[in-house]
Amino acid sequence: CKAMHVAQPAVVLASSRGIASFVCEYASPGKATEVRVTVLRQADSQVTEVCAATYMMGNELTFLDDSICTGTSSGNQVNLTIQGLRAMDTGLYICKVELMYPPPYYLGIGNGTQIYVIDPEPCPDSDF
């Protein structure tokens, strides 16, 4: 297993609709054809997997159908979007990149992006 540098923004504020996007950029030492990207959430020392996708270079990222993540890739950059976020989802979102094929296997973990989320103000009840 060889180490690889991964860069991501330090902080992002989600939109009022609970959507946060950020770029995860990795310094690929070789010509990888198969890449796996995992988003981890760290909150209060607990780390949980948010979503993961494996893609072939030049192809779209494919997350599971029920995933809250979507993404696109361009060269050594992955543009990740996380949807359906609530205030309670505020936390550090860490990008983990693995170069799966061809060998050698490379692993890179970013410092994390602190995503802040604020629940929208509830709409006042209407009389209709």
């Epitope: 923004p9 330090a10 209060d44």
Partner: antibody, heavy 117, light 107 residues
Framework: QVQLVQSGAEVKKPGASVKVSCKAS????????ISWVRQAPGQGLECMGW????????NYAQNLQGRVTMTTDTSTNTAYMELRSLRSDDTAVYYC??????????WGQGTLVTVSS | EIVLTQSPDFQSVTPKEKVTITCRAS??????LHWYQQKPDQSPKLLIK???QSISGVPSRFSGSGSGTDFTLTINSLEAEDAAAYYC?????????FGPGTKVDIK
């Protein structure tokens, strides 16, 4: 090294607007946010809100909603805070600070805004 | 909104004495609590981040502890240059909030 340099002191009349700038250097501007904090004479620190320089999204203090606008210009690495309909109790020193993963590690030198008729 | 309360409001201390300032959050904020020092006519300066993590360049006499709702800033062996206001600040959830501050002066 990281620096936040703010614009100079302002004297405004009640009802006017003020726009304070905060020029950042020494780091990748869009990787962080910029918060704005004010301090009335002899008082504590009050969070006015912040802006994510990465995407321009903002979060304002509820008591200032509708009167404050925070923006960034990523071409010049500068953040701006505009406060409208100024009142005498808006007289304060206004600070910008870099928002990282939690702590605010760098602050501007402060801008004194005086509202007086 | 998470409300932070600090005690005491004011403390007058002799040099070399130990100072303890407490900060209480209205709900659990984990360790997302930071301490700032502000000297007269100066910008605030980060002293301690994430409840207990030290900051490069800050004297080792400053330390922090706590998690959840109760936090403490300790100044061991106070020096004359430590006369300042001290603020706690939470970054656990929006909106960000500060405590009202504790003013420390030298007897």
């Amino acid at each position: 090294q990281v620096q936040l340099v703010q614009s100079g002191a302002e004297v405004k009349k009640p009802g006017a607007s003020v726009k304070v700038s905060c020029k950042a250097s020494g780091y990748t501007f869009t990787d962080y946010g910029i918060s704005w904090v004010r301090q009335a004479p002899g008082q504590g620190l009050e969070c006015m809100g912040w802006i994510s320089a990465y995407n321009g999204n903002t979060n304002y203090a509820q008591n200032l909603q509708g009167r404050v606008t925070m923006t960034t210009d990523t071409s010049t690495n500068t953040a701006y805070m505009e406060l409208r309909s100024l009142r005498s109790d808006d007289t304060a020193v206004y600070y910008c600070a870099r928002v990282g993963a939690g702590d605010w590690d760098y602050w501007g030198q402060g801008t004194l805004v005086t509202v007086s008729s | 909104e998470i409300v932070l309360t600090q005690s005491p409001d004011f403390q007058s201390v002799t040099p070399k004495e130990k100072v303890t300032i407490t900060c209480r959050a209205s709900q659990s904020i984990g360790s997302s609590l930071h301490w700032y020092q502000q000297k007269p006519d100066q910008s605030p300066k980060l002293l301690i981040k994430y409840a207990s993590q030290s900051i490069s360049g800050v004297p080792s006499r400053f330390s922090g502890s706590g998690s959840g709702t109760d936090f403490t800033l300790t100044i061991n062996s106070l020096e004359a240059e430590d006369a300042a206001a001290y603020y706690c600040h939470q970054s656990s959830s929006l909106p960000f909030t500060f405590g009202p501050g504790t003013k420390v002066d030298i007897k």
